[in-house]
């Protein structure tokens, strides 16, 4: 809790690490040869910049931010990544017909910087 001390984006609205949704077809995802349904997925992903202390996941992310300011060529800024996921079930093709399979790390639920 101590690390996640910044939810105000200094770069302006919508520019910092956030959840973003893109509608994608099975063809877009390259899944058409093994997934039958759903034909379209509302893919939620994490995008945006991670400026100083914004949604820092932990102390390591805070340290990374500080060192990036000092040595930008050596230490990269924290990255915007999923903090948790929403599970999703797919109907897949199998040798014998179709089956269900659930994936617990397919869709981002919320985001942080790490």
């Amino acid at each position: 809790a101590r690390a996640r001390n910044g939810d105000h984006c200094p770069l302006g609205p919508g520019r910092c690490c956030r959840l973003h949704t893109v509608r994608a077809s099975l063809e877009d995802l390259g899944w058409a040869d093994w997934v039958l349904r759903p034909r379209e997925v509302q893919v939620t992903m994490c995008i945006g910049a991670c400026p100083s202390q914004f949604r820092a996941a932990n102390m390591h992310a805070q340290i990374k931010t500080s060192l990036h300011r000092l040595k930008p060529d050596t230490v990269p800024a924290p990255c915007c990544v999923p903090a948790s996921y929403n599970p999703m079930v797919l109907i897949q093709k199998t040798d014998t017909g179709v089956s269900l399979q659930t994936y617990d790390d397919l869709l981002a639920k919320d985001c942080h910087c790490i």
Epitope: L36, R37, I91, V98
Partner: antibody
Framework: EVQLVQSGAEVKKPGESLKISCKGS????????IGWVRQMPGKGLEWMGV????????IYSPSFQGQVTISADKSISTAYLQWSSLKASDTAMYYC????????????WGQGTLVTVSS | QSVLTQPPSVSGAPGQRVTISCSGS????????VNWYQQLPGTAPKLLIY???NRPSGVPDRFSGSKSGTSASLAITGLQAEDEADYYC??????????FGGGTKLTVLG
């Protein structure tokens, strides 16, 4: 308003066939999967199978594979559960339920159809 | 025998907090999600909690879900007479797809 309306209660004899229905309204019927769940008298919930109405793909629980048939008619937004030869042990309440957005939970349920099989 | 294990019954007085457990294994709850349903007497089940800890709109915040390891729990605070019902957990299992717990009957005392 999302609604799943099931057909009425049925009383049948062993060996008879039966087809019960579940009509969806208030949403795009082909955009959500429909599942069937059995509840025997005084017992818990058992997942029977699922159908994707847009392509009529069906997957059954191993416990119900070959015992029942799940189908759908997207032109009238209706899913079906049928038996070719009922047994006394099929006596139960049967619920249809719509799957939520990610296919992991049931967000809307029908009111249930009570099927009684007795000689 | 259900893949997910719940206590057959729990009880509490109005205003109290009760919890209902749901125990699974590494092939279901351990790696995946848990949903909870409420079934009032003589009615169809209703979604109460999805993906471990999310409440659908219209469900009071007195109901909350959590998951730890291969177990999950449903907590109900400020117990009310109308909470008397059967509660079911549900998850996914690689061998049988969607699985339910055996159900827990909640009795509100007094």
């Amino acid at each position: 308003e999302v609604q799943l309306v099931q057909s009425g209660a049925e009383v049948k004899k062993p060996g008879e066939s039966l087809k019960i229905s579940c009509k969806g309204s208030g949403y795009s019927f082909t955009s959500y999967w429909i599942g069937w769940v059995r509840q025997m008298p005084g017992k818990g919930l058992e997942w029977m199978g699922v159908i994707d109405p847009s392509g009529s793909y069906t997957i059954y629980s191993p416990s119900f594979q070959g015992q029942v048939t799940i189908s759908a008619d997207k032109s009238i937004s209706t899913a079906y559960l049928q038996w070719s030869s009922l047994k006394a042990s099929d006596t139960a309440m049967y619920y249809c339920a719509r799957y939520g957005r990610y296919g992991t939970y049931f967000d809307y349920w029908g009111q249930g159809t009570l099927v009684t099989v007795s000689s | 025998q259900s893949v997910l294990t719940q206590p057959p019954s729990v009880s509490g007085a109005p205003g109290q907090r009760v919890t209902i457990s749901c125990s699974g294994s590494s092939s279901n709850i351990g790696v995946l999600y848990v949903n909870w349903y409420q079934q009032l007497p003589g009615t169809a089940p209703k979604l109460l909690i999805y993906s471990n800890d999310n409440r659908p709109s219209g469900v009071p915040d007195r109901f909350s879900g959590s998951k730890s390891g291969t177990s999950a729990s449903l907590a109900i605070t400020g117990l009310q007479a109308e909470d008397e019902a059967d509660y079911y957990c549900q998850s996914w299992d690689s061998s049988s797809n969607y699985v339910f717990g055996g159900g827990t009957k909640l009795t509100v005392l007094g």
